[in-house]
């Protein structure tokens, strides 16, 4: 019996087609992805093959203005239109709190939404009961397939799930649910979830009875043969993990942003043994036409976005200096504003010992592309912010050793004075450079804001200590020559859309007046 698994993950609000790098589509003939194109391919496969499941491994939420405006209603609407069979909850599904998940998505989705390792407690337990499930048994042709969901246990540090959801260890939570499916005589089981490739592999290795793992969160690109676009494969598709008891378990993921449709064919015998598995992600490029009815629907929903772009988010009473002449040479108040917004967006998980889990931000000056003039009645719009941050990136959370941070700050000024983009803007950091010294030895003082303290204060950076830092995904991926960050980071979790972070902060503050205050000397 053959099953075709179609899968997406980390789509992050890319409802419309995008450019090859998943930013805004400029030249339509070169654009990729989008739900209209995805629907064409899915329907083509559904017509050609008998047993097809369309699955999503989480993080549909967050990433473009679509989510900012529609807050998840767009996810439910278009996933329903594409007739997804199941979805696992990702960490970003909690970005607008539990209410922001329940109302727009859980109550509106016509497909099961799954997570076995999220347990509701207190008043939320009855409110959310039945709206998401640990597993679902789906009829496929003459057979049944069990889908069991999971979500990153780091979600409380990455999003806003509140205090009434407990995120358990994935493996501990999955095993009893898989055992339950086994007692129900379900012998074909897919683990669908959002914890990253390393955890996906661990689930394949440790959770007895799981036949296939369909994952997300780490934006992992797997491919067998010559890859069709710019993404470099992290391994073969499917990636085969040998479980502790000797089962050969295919693990798949389909990069991100709806650029690819994962396509996996699994052959089962009558006992549910996986006899063979093969496939590859399908690049959703312009050779696949956009479905006209879905495209028309997208265009209808688009109208509200254009209106939103010009609405006032808040006001500034000072000039927001985002000029390259400032931000690539010295501390600029636009850099301070953005870093403050980045930290504010990550205010969560305080306890008796920590006022927050993260206090530091770094931001390449070259990523700030425009100033905002306060003389336009002080008005700040989404459109203004899109000019400042035009690349459609995310502000991510990483863990780095102090020694890596020191290298990053040396790199920041290694060729100072040439208007290059690597000059770092900061938050929660005081750095002093001596530019008379030779490159690689110019950082003379580096103090960082404590987190394990009731009154935040600046302490000298410790080389062997591990620090959490918020930074653009561009830097986490080694952009602007920050290879040391990419090579030495100990953990990397993707965060929220850059413009969305700043716009939320401005809306919250209502009136802003960031200053140059001696963070960089």
């Amino acid at each position: 019996w053959e099953l075709t698994i179609l899968h997406t993950n980390d789509v992050h609000s890319r409802l419309e087609q995008t450019s090859e790098d998943s930013s805004k589509c400029v030249n339509a003939s070169r654009c990729m992805g989008g739900v209209a194109r995805l629907f064409t391919k899915v329907q083509q496969i559904r017509r050609a093959e008998p047993n097809v499941l369309l699955l999503d491994a989480g993080d549909q939420y967050q990433g473009t203005i679509w989510f900012t405006v529609y807050k998840g209603a767009e996810v439910a609407h278009f996933m329903n239109a594409l007739r997804y069979d199941a979805m696992a909850l990702g960490n970003h599904e909690f970005d607008n709190g539990v209410e922001g998940l329940i109302e727009p998505l859980l109550k509106e989705a016509k497909f099961p939404i799954l997570s076995a390792n999220i347990k509701a407690k207190g008043p939320l337990a009855s409110q959310i009961s039945g709206l998401y499930l640990p597993y679902k048994v789906l009829p496929v042709g003459d057979e049944v397939v069990g889908i069991v969901g999971y979500t990153s246990k780091e979600t409380p540090f990455l999003s806003n799930p509140g205090t009434n959801l407990v995120f358990e260890d994935e493996i501990t939570a999955l095993q009893p649910e898989v055992d339950k499916l086994k007692t129900l005589n379900v012998n074909k089981i897919i683990a669908l979830g959002h914890s990253g490739f390393e955890t996906d592999k661990l689930i394949a290795q440790k959770v007895r009875g799981v036949d296939v793992v369909v994952g997300g969160h780490s934006n992992t690109f797997l491919y067998t043969g010559n890859p069709p676009s710019k993404e470099v494969p992290a391994g073969k598709y499917p990636f085969i993990v040998t479980s502790d008891d000797g089962r050969k378990v295919p693990v798949v993921q389909a990069y991100a942003f709806g650029k690819y449709l994962g396509y996996l064919k699994i052959e089962f015998d009558e006992r549910g043994n996986v006899i063979s598995s093969h496939g590859n992600p399908i690049l959703l490029n312009s050779s696949i036409p956009e479905d006209p009815s879905i495209k028309a629907d997208i265009n209808k929903w688009r109208i509200k976005l254009d209106n939103y772009s010009t609405q006032e988010l808040g006001k500034t009473i000072v000039y927001l200096d985002g000029s390259s002449q400032s931000c690539r040479f010295r501390e600029c108040n636009m850099g301070n504003l953005i870093c403050d917004a980045m930290i504010n967006n990550n205010l969560r998980h305080a306890d008796e010992m920590f006022w927050n889990h993260v206090s530091m931000c770094i931001l390449n000056g070259g990523g700030i592309r425009s100033p905002i003039d306060e003389r336009n009645n002080g008005t700040i719009t989404w459109e203004n912010l899109a000019a400042v941050l035009p690349f459609g990136g995310t502000f991510d959370l990483v863990q780095l050793k102090g020694s890596t941070l020191k290298k990053a700050f040396e790199h920041s000024v290694h060729r100072y004075g040439q208007s290059t983009g690597e000059f770092l803007q900061v938050g929660g950091i005081h750095v002093v450079y001596d530019l008379s010294r030779k490159p690689g030895d110019r950082v003379v003082k580096l103090d960082v804001l404590c987190t394990k303290c009731r009154v935040p204060s600046y302490d000298p950076l410790k080389m062997d200590e591990i620090y959490k830092v918020i930074l653009p995904n561009f830097l986490a991926n080694g952009g602007d020559g920050f290879q040391m960050i990419k090579d030495e980071l100990l953990r990397h979790d993707s965060g929220d859309q850059d413009i969305n972070v700043v716009s939320t902060y401005i809306s919250k503050m209502k009136v802003i007046y960031p200053a140059v205050e001696g963070r960089i000397k």
């Epitope: 085969i240 008891d245 000797g246 089962r247 052959e267 549910g272 043994n273 996986v274 063979s276």
Partner: antibody, heavy 119, light 107 residues
Framework: QVQFQQSGAELARPGASVKLSCKAS????????IQWVKQRPGQGLEWIGA????????RYTQKFKGRATLTADTSSSTAYMQLSSLASEDSAVYYC????????????WGAGTTVTVSS | DIQMTQTTSSLSASLGDRVTISCRAS??????LNWYQQKPDGTVKLLIH???RLHSGVPSRFSGSGSGTDYSLTISNLEQEDIATYFC?????????FGGGTKLEIK
């Protein structure tokens, strides 16, 4: 239907080696583990080890590590077990069987090969 | 390694009898218990997997039960062709291990 054809009886001297074969038919050879089981006369069954022909992954019980070598030839759908440094206690019937990994049961068995170790 | 113990090494019963053969594991094996029949000619067949699931083609007079460490195989209406030795095997943890066997004879 699924079947295993095992090689004929072997007579070997102590210290010698034997190589037993098990030819599979009626199923996808590369999709299942082949298990090897020993039974001494009048005794119970003892698991030796297993091979997954799809990638030549092997597992052995501690007692047979280093002395049993499992191999598989996918072109002929045949699994082999070589047993070296034979002693009288290796005189037994050796079975190959197909392993189901949902419950790790052995659902189809060969008829067995008798090995006699004698000087 | 998990030890599998079949305390009764041989059992006599009459045709038509209900016969129960037991098997004990040295630790919890989470229902991953399989039963085999070995005929006097050496032929081995799977009867039951995962404690109670009848393998295809096996007569319905065979049934299995148990949990944790204690398991049993029942033949509800003994027939002549059931004369054989019965082995249990755990599929919970490598290495897979078998019980010593229970030989069933006719009274």
């Amino acid at each position: 239907q699924v079947q295993f054809q095992q090689s004929g009886a072997e007579l070997a001297r102590p210290g010698a080696s034997v190589k037993l074969s098990c030819k599979a038919s009626g199923y996808t050879f590369t999709g299942y583990w082949i298990q090897w089981v020993k039974q001494r006369p009048g005794q119970g069954l003892e698991w030796i080890g297993a091979i997954y022909p799809g990638d030549d992954d092997t597992r052995y019980t501690q007692k047979f590590k280093g002395r049993a070598t499992l191999t598989a030839d996918t072109s002929s759908s045949t699994a082999y077990m070589q047993l070296s440094s034979l002693a009288s206690e290796d005189s037994a019937v050796y079975y190959c069987a197909r392993g189901n990994w949902d419950d790790w049961d052995f659902d189809v068995w060969g008829a067995g090969t008798t090995v006699t170790v004698s000087s | 390694d998990i030890q599998m113990t079949q305390t009764t090494s041989s059992l006599s019963a009459s045709l038509g009898d209900r016969v129960t053969i037991s098997c004990r594991a040295s630790q919890d094996i989470s229902n991953y218990l399989n039963w085999y029949q070995q005929k006097p000619d050496g032929t081995v067949k799977l009867l039951i997997h995962y404690t109670s699931r009848l393998h295809s083609g096996v007569p319905s007079r065979f049934s299995g039960s148990g949990s944790g460490t204690d398991y049993s195989l029942t033949i509800s209406n003994l027939e002549q062709e059931d004369i054989a030795t019965y082995f249990c095997q755990q599929g919970d943890t490598l290495p897979w291990t078998f019980g010593g066997g229970t030989k069933l004879e006719i009274k």
